[in-house]
């Protein structure tokens, strides 16, 4: 391959070349979250499209059971945005009362587990508090970024209240991962 | 090429194999949007800078009329931020004259036009209620996911209000593509 | 190499082909802030951990002394989230006393320094104003977005108020980039 | 191309009111707000407030509280200014203008003089 | 409310000269600056933005700087078209505020 004779010098070993439309790849969307039984101390799990509308998964990143399955050991990014939707939080009564007060959050992380490590790892954490004056109030919390996964490892979305969460539209609330 | 031998063993037709610095990518930062006209029941596009400053488009990517047209089917990472400010929102005033309270929102889209498609796709959605208490607020939206793209499509960012977007700065508003 | 028959026809001319697995990669995550000089008229910078944990740098992308340091010229993708918590801002107090109003606020600017350039370049800022009701308030700002840099370059992370940021946890507050 | 094109002058006495029409063309009405400013004789631009013309909402300078009032009627793409209680300070051209943001104004009307003279 | 003051409040100058006008504001406006030209008996016209971002079709001679609370207007080259008032505006807060204008005039 010709062009290969310009190749940064600095590439002292030979890593495999790979075609960029064979890599791990899986956008995943909202859907309506049934009521489940969730792990107890761990924010539940959200569930998500795979194949519907926007969503796909491909070259063997597959999606089951709230899991997406990395079949492949790199870095990847990661990324998912969850819209929050809720009517006003008990936050400003509770300060107009005089009472000390703490804020109402809201939390999205994207977990990882790995089969041979017990505890499930946290790669990334949006939270914040509100505390809105009105009376109905809305708000997505995007997170990304890249990660050094195994093959087997499996990511999962979960939020502080599932019943906050906008499934109404794919484009609002959404999960996924790269193979970079 | 020696390094091919090295090849996950999983790749069992031979892809393409691509220089990533020919790969399609854009980066537009904001400018001052001039009042236009908008279509109607579609929330307005905003136009970009696409040559100067930190703004660039390469390898057939073209920015032309709002829209960045991609030239190349395949899976494209797509974002953008636009960041709002305004004055006071009239929530906090109707909730205290005791009246049922619909709060402002501020909202951002990533929509997909494809000319074979009668309906333009949103994409990716950031939308958020705006109740602030003080006189002026300010406050980013960022969206970005990966997305499967056929040449031909074209993209666009629309938002709810305008002139609520911060124009000053090429950092604080923008919009990019780059196929992976 | 027999996958390159199928390449697109308009690669005229044989680019570098690159492993991506050896393309310069960094993620970086929160570690306490200890009290610095900073420059004057401008953001304290954060320092990071770069090792540890999530943390690590790759393929000749080094960190040091705050800065991201670029091994090799590029296409890349930048992110951070910067996660702020605090008390109650006077923005209400102030409001509510009739007083004008300046809300306060919190920022997070991704920075390039060029060595032969006398300034540094923001390339992305998240701004946002602060006046929450509730005593105390938690909140992330994220980024991303993708530039073209030059070998040699630099990237920092600012911040309005060190003090602000919450250094608890690795998956709240990060920085990273990673060439394309 | 955008246009505005606002009433013609106008003469008051002390203590009535006025109100100027702005007719706006060549853009989304209700997507821009429309500001009116005001210049006495020989002297300098001073902003009297606001109106979104999507949702009505207004914000008026401080000085005009209370006697001036900002509407539109987006049927026809048009934006008022009313200003009440009229002295001789009050006369001026007064001035509609469109920004791309709340913050500046791209476009000006061609202005209205309003003399108030008894 | 923010004040704006500008100085010199007039300006004598000749075709192709270099002039420069200053904003003030009595606090911080970050970029929010705005800067207008006005020829008698007409409207302002619209020349930048954002302290230091031309307006489209306003010709590169003229430029804009600063940030905070001192701004600067600078036209490189005068030609005689150029001769006006000018005025800066605070686009930060309402109420907004315009600078008193500097009268530029031929010598």
């Known amino acids: 391959l010709k062009g290969q004779e310009f190749a940064p010098s600095h590439q002292q070993v030979y890593a495999p070349l790979r075609a960029d439309g064979d890599k791990p790849r899986a956008h995943l969307t909202v859907v309506r979250q049934t009521p489940t039984q969730h792990f107890k101390n761990q924010f539940p799990a959200l569930h998500w499209e795979h194949e519907l509308g926007l969503a796909f998964t491909k070259n063997r990143m597959n999606y089951t059971n709230k899991f997406l399955l990395i079949p492949e050991s790199g870095d990847y990014f990661i990324y998912s945005q969850v819209t929050f939707r809720g009517m006003t939080s008990e936050c400003s009564e509770i300060r107009q009362a005089g009472r000390p007060n703490k804020p109402d959050s809201i939390t999205v992380v994207i977990t990882k587990v790995t089969d041979s490590y017990p505890e499930p790892t946290q790669l990334l954490m949006g939270t914040k508090s509100v505390c809105e004056v009105g009376s109905n109030w809305f708000q997505p919390i995007y997170l990304g970024a890249m990660f050094s996964l195994q093959e087997g490892d499996k990511l999962m979305v979960n939020v502080s209240d599932i019943s906050l969460v906008d499934y109404t539209k794919e484009d609002k609330t959404f999960f996924g991962a790269f193979l970079l | 090429l020696k390094g091919q031998e090295f090849a996950p063993s999983h790749q069992q037709v031979y892809a393409p194999l691509r220089a990533d610095g020919d790969k399609p990518r854009a980066h537009l930062t904001v400018v001052r949007q001039t009042p236009t006209q908008h279509f109607k029941n579609q929330f307005p596009a905003l136009h970009w800078e696409h040559e100067l400053g930190l703004a660039f488009t390469k390898n057939r990517m073209n920015y032309t009329n709002k829209f960045l047209l991609i030239p190349e089917s395949g899976d494209y990472f797509i974002y953008s931020q636009v960041t709002f400010r305004g004055m006071t929102s009239e929530c906090s005033e109707i909730r205290q004259a005791g009246r049922p309270n619909k709060p402002d929102s501020i909202t951002v889209v990533i929509t997909k036009v494809t000319d074979s498609y009668p309906e333009p796709t949103q994409l990716l959605m950031g939308t958020k209620s705006v109740c602030e208490v003080g006189s002026n607020w300010f406050q980013p939206i960022y969206l970005g996911a990966m997305f499967s793209l056929q040449e031909g499509d074209k993209l666009m960012v629309n938002v709810s209000d305008i002139s609520l977007v911060d124009y000053t700065k090429e950092d604080k508003t923008f919009f990019g593509a780059f196929l992976l | 190499l027999k996958g390159q028959e199928f390449a697109p026809s308009h690669q005229q001319v044989y680019a570098p082909l690159r492993a991506d697995g050896d393309k310069p990669r960094a993620h970086l995550t929160v570690v306490r802030q200890t009290p610095t000089q900073h420059f004057k008229n401008q953001f304290p910078a954060l320092h990071w951990e770069h090792e540890l944990g999530l943390a690590f740098t790759k393929n000749r992308m080094n960190y040091t002394n705050k800065f991201l340091l670029i091994p090799e010229s590029g296409d890349y993708f930048i992110y951070s989230q910067v996660t702020f918590r605090g008390m109650t801002s006077e923005c209400s107090e102030i409001r509510q006393a009739g007083r004008p109003n300046k809300p306060d606020s919190i920022t997070v600017v991704i920075t390039k320094v060029t060595d032969s350039y006398p300034e540094p370049t923001q390339l992305l800022m998240g701004t946002k104003s602060v006046c929450e009701v509730g005593s105390n308030w938690f909140q992330p700002i994220y980024l991303g977005a993708m530039f073209s840099l030059q070998e040699g370059d630099k990237l920092m992370v600012n911040v309005s108020d060190i003090s602000l940021v919450d250094y608890t946890k690795e998956d709240k507050t990060f920085f990273g980039a990673f060439l394309l | 191309q955008v246009q505005l094109v606002q009433s013609g002058a106008e003469v008051k006495e002390p203590g009535a009111s006025v109100k100027v029409s702005c007719k706006a063309s060549?853009?989304?009405?209700?997507?821009?707000?429309m500001h009116w400013v005001r210049q006495a004789p020989g002297q300098g631009l001073e902003w009297m407030g606001w109106i979104n013309p999507n949702s009505g909402g207004t914000n008026y300078a401080q000085q005009f509280q209370g006697r001036v009032t900002m509407t539109r009627d987006t049927s026809i793409s048009t934006a008022y200014m009313e200003l009440s209680r009229l002295t001789s300070d009050d006369t001026a051209v007064y001035y509609c203008?469109?920004?791309?943001?709340?913050?500046?104004?791209?476009?000006w009307g061609q202005g209205t003089m309003v003399t108030v003279s008894s | 409310d923010i004040q704006m003051t500008q100085s010199p409040s007039s300006l004598s100058a000749s075709v192709g000269d270099r002039v420069t006008i200053t904003c003030r504001a009595s606090?911080?406006?970050?970029?929010?600056l705005n800067w207008y030209q006005q020829k008698p008996g007409k409207a302002p016209k619209f020349l930048i933005y954002?302290?230091?971002r031309l307006q489209s079709g306003v010709p590169s001679r003229f430029s804009g700087s600063g940030s905070g609370t001192d701004f600067t207007l600078s036209i490189s080259s005068l030609q005689p078209e150029d001769f006006a008032t000018y005025y800066c505006q605070q686009g930060h807060s309402t109420p907004f505020t315009f600078g008193p204008g500097t009268k530029l005039e031929i010598k």
């Open positions: 060549g853009y989304t009405f209700t997507a821009y707000y």
């Open positions: 606090q911080s406006i970050s970029s929010y």
């Open positions: 954002g302290a230091s």
């Open positions: 203008a469109v920004g791309g943001s709340y913050d500046a104004f791209d476009i």
